[in-house]
Amino acid sequence: FNISGCSTKKLLWTYSTRSEEEFVLFCDLPEPQKSHFCHRNRLSPKQVPEHLPFMGSNDLSDVQWYQQPSNGDPLEDIRKSYPHIIQDKCTLHFLTPGVNNSGSYICRPKMIKSPYDVACCVKMILEVKPQTNASCEYSASHKQDLLLGSTGSISCPSLSCQSDAQSPAVTWYKNGKLLSVERSNRIVVDEVYDYHQGTYVCDYTQSDTVSSWTVRAVVQVRTIVGDTKLKPDILDPVEDTLEVELGKPLTISCKARFGFERVFNPVIKWYIKDSDLEWEVSVPEAKSIKSTLKDEIIERNIILEKVTQRDLRRKFVCFVQNSIGNTTQSVQLKEKRG
């Protein structure tokens, strides 16, 4: 199809080489066409058109994304050619940064239902650059945490070194929905609730004498509880002796509950004590069996192919540790009688 009639938007993605970050493009269909498509909630009351010529479907996934090759080849269907780019409804998600994402992206409705719709498309010219200047030493991360129940703020990474007075107007989206009242370089939250978690996008406009473009950044926000003040609990084993049958295989499970820590480096391991000797046992990897906002339960098993007489003289010790401290629970094997 002819893309010369598409509305055009220029975007800049400046990514940090130090951290993983994502990027998104919204299918910003031109007014008035977008009204039946994506982000209808992004229209302000003053923008609602009286005349709605674009009779598209209300299905929010009814758009098609293409990339325009720089060599002038035909448009390529994003879904077929680019595994690191995912379409979710009207949003294109870039999972990995890199200058190779630079290019022209076109979106349009899948279904053309009226003559007006032929030009119902938007071309986004995306420029991707690595961050070069270290002028802003403490620029905000693309992953930010908010402490539940307290005050907090979400900063736009590309503007986090600007004072409020200098900051240009910022357009914020949360999970693809426009936050029309948020216009600052940071969203100040009076009290953090779990619904503040999500994917935030901040846009601001930069101009020179020739043109203007949108600088965009994506911030993943999670809501967290305060770091635990407790060392981990061992939930299992509870008893310090375990009845076993000689010659049979045995699995002993160690389950421990670790309180939330922002920097989480849990340790859970088994070691064996035999008279004056002790050594760590090579056992299967630990696995998380339950994770909540406040804590995580991690399990690690020790597996004996068959219980021997020697095992009865040993102590099997589960050792767990977080940044606060460690806890151990030892198990002595006892032969089952009768």
Partner: antibody, heavy 113, light 111 residues
Framework: SVEESGGRLVTPGTPLTLTCTVS????????MSWVRQAPGKGLEYIGI?????TTYYANWAKGRFTIAKTSTTVNLKITSPTTEDTATYFC???????????WGPGTLVTVSL | AAVLTQTPSPVSAAVGGTVSISCQSS????????LSWFQQKPGQPPKLLIY???TLASGVPSRFKGSGSGTQFTLTISDVQCDDAATYYC???????????FGRGTEVVVK
Amino acid sequence: SVEESGGRLVTPGTPLTLTCTVSGFSLNSYDMSWVRQAPGKGLEYIGIIYNSGTTYYANWAKGRFTIAKTSTTVNLKITSPTTEDTATYFCARTHNTLPFYIWGPGTLVTVSL
Amino acid sequence: AAVLTQTPSPVSAAVGGTVSISCQSSPSVYNNNRLSWFQQKPGQPPKLLIYYASTLASGVPSRFKGSGSGTQFTLTISDVQCDDAATYYCAGGYSSISDNGFGRGTEVVVK
């Protein structure tokens, strides 16, 4: 900086457009608000124009005012002035939908027969 | 429509003393913190003192302090100076931008 102009004596019903001229920053990047103050009275928020051109008006101001912009100016049109519209009109660079640091000195509009 | 009710004028303060002005919002301001305080002297445009309910604007002396959340807010001026004689306005931002507005103002007279 920000400076308002266009304030003058008008008769009721005669439309009047006020202009706010900005320098040192781009209207492509900042939101702007209009606020007015009747003689001896308090401040009244009229409305805001976003850098994108989207406008919002205070409930009381809807239909009575129109805000628009060019590359360097923000205009406030008083569609059909009445004597109650006599006031000093200020424009201000806006932060998060509320007027912020940079205010103009104001321009006086007098509506009288 | 939102209503911002300020302490009635005038309020007297002695030099070196402390004065508090209250501002009550109905309904709650956006995010419980979208409230600003302005100082205005005759013949001048307003000057921003506080935003986000408690953040001091650049260049404003720390004698000015904003507090409160949701519907109840206070501007406190400690160690009052003669230069603080002015009218003080609160301004609220709301989830419907059309509700944004100012309180009626509180005149502070310094003795």
